[in-house]
Interface confidence: medium
């Protein structure tokens, strides 16, 4: 199997991790999505998930984790606010598609949180500190109990993209479910 690629984020305590997971395939728009941590020698552990079916632009908060699924963009936004050193680790976005195993999105995220003064709240472009106000509509969602020992056996190709069009101006061949499309992150 191809080695899974990682994207590294180095942040200070109190800052906010803000990542976008691109799910590319329209069929996944309403699927339940989750944010998982992968610890050495352990199965991925689900920390937070969207509702089932996933609602458009509807924030879900579990502790310091906020998930927002933007169906118009095909993007899942994941934020971990007020980061702590112990949050350091390897994370991934997945789509739950029972009875099949979860489908991994994008590159895995290698988060490194260090101690240190991070400036005034909101002063760092990578940080919203802990001043972010959660909308009152925020809900908690129940995640499936199972976790999978493996997510995918193949890494998403780095920086590639599909080019399907609504009017089939381009014919797609050999398009897999795991395609990375550029987004501003």
């Amino acid at each position: 199997a191809t080695k899974l690629t990682e994207e590294k984020y180095e942040l200070k305590e109190g800052q906010t991790l803000d990542v976008k997971c691109d799910y590319t395939l329209e069929k996944f728009a309403s699927s339940q999505k989750a944010w998982q941590i992968i610890r050495d020698g352990e199965m991925p552990k689900t920390l937070a998930c969207t509702e089932r079916p996933s609602k458009n632009s509807h924030p879900v908060q579990v502790g310091r984790i906020i998930l927002e699924d933007y169906h118009d963009h095909g993007l899942l936004r994941v934020r971990m606010v007020n980061l702590q050193v112990e949050d350091s680790g390897l994370y991934q976005c997945v789509i739950y598609q029972p009875p099949k195993e979860p489908h991994m999105l994008f590159d895995r995220i290698r988060l490194v949180v260090t101690k240190g003064f991070s400036g005034t709240p909101g002063s760092n472009e990578n940080s919203t500190q802990n001043v972010y106000k959660i909308p009152p509509t925020t809900t908690k969602a129940l995640c499936p109990l199972y976790t999978s020992p493996r997510t995918v056996t193949q890494a998403p190709p780095k920086s590639t993209a599909d080019v399907s069009t609504p009017d089939s101006e381009i014919n797609l061949t050999n398009v897999t479910d795991i395609i990375r499309v550029p987004v501003f992150n």
Partner: antibody
Framework: QVQLVQSGAEVKKPGSSVKVSCKAS????????ISWVRQAPGQGLEWMGG????????NYAQKFQGRVTITADESTNTAYMDLSSLRSEDTAVYYC???????????????????WGQGTTVTVSS | DIQMTQSPTSLSASVGDRVTITCRAS??????LAWYQQKPEKAPKSLIY???SLQSGVPSRFSGSGSGTDFTLTISSLQPEDFATYYC?????????FGQGTKLEIK
């Protein structure tokens, strides 16, 4: 039909900053990314960075990292490009351009930069 | 960063000619390539996206082809309004990068 309307020409002194705005008229920023592209006199096009307005953080070309800040205000459908520590070589026409992400039959995909602003001339001179 | 190299950098042609401009990416960009036309003192105009899809309202004499690293813009029969500078641009990965441009002049 969405149009991008940019703010007027600016004359700035070296070392100062400039903030150029780009307002979507006749539509919204929904499902779009906004890029900023500049063109120095007699030169080609240069991508500076961009932002998806529903998200707060921009993405910048390495060349401009630390000097450029791109923001967007969804409530007014306006994007902004702030360039600091100006020098004479920043004299250029600055364009905003929209890239739309849409849902196809089975996939999401992007158009190229399908709608452009009229351009804002920034002159840096002492 | 991905480098985009256009050729030729300038081209003289006559009305009615068939013209081809090529663009090469320094690494594979799938079909994430756009072509733009720019006239003096005007903003660029999008012609082609996703390598071969015609942007709405663009005349059918413009066509694009290619994938991976090699791409082509073809104008099947040049019209007087087509004399301009043409740019290719990759949007497969950030930073987006443009070719240096091809100036199409009247022979």
């Amino acid at each position: 039909q969405v149009q991008l309307v940019q703010s007027g020409a600016e004359v700035k002194k070296p070392g100062s900053s400039v903030k150029v705005s780009c307002k979507a008229s006749g539509g919204t920023f929904s499902s779009s990314a906004i890029s900023w592209v500049r063109q120095a006199p007699g030169q080609g096009l240069e991508w500076m960075g961009g932002i998806i307005p529903i998200f707060s953080t921009g993405n910048y070309a390495q060349k401009f990292q630390g000097r450029v800040t791109i923001t967007a205000d969804e409530s007014t459908n306006t994007a902004y490009m702030d360039l600091s520590s100006l020098r004479s070589e920043d004299t250029a026409v600055y364009y905003c351009a929209r890239s739309t992400r849409v849902r196809g039959v089975s996939h999401y995909y992007y158009y190229g930069l399908d709608v452009w602003g009229q351009g804002t001339t920034v002159t840096v001179s002492s | 960063d991905i480098q985009m190299t256009q050729s030729p950098t300038s081209l003289s042609a006559s009305v009615g000619d068939r013209v081809t401009i090529t663009c090469r990416a320094s690494q594979g960009i799938s079909s994430w390539l756009a072509w733009y036309q720019q006239k003096p003192e005007k903003a660029p105009k999008s012609l082609i996206y996703a390598a071969s899809s015609l942007q709405s309202g663009v005349p059918s004499r413009f066509s694009g082809s290619g994938s991976g690293t090699d791409f082509t813009l073809t104008i099947s029969s040049l019209q007087p309004e087509d004399f301009a500078t043409y740019y290719c641009q990759q949007y497969n990965s950030y930073p987006y990068t443009f070719g240096q441009g091809t100036k199409l002049e009247i022979k």
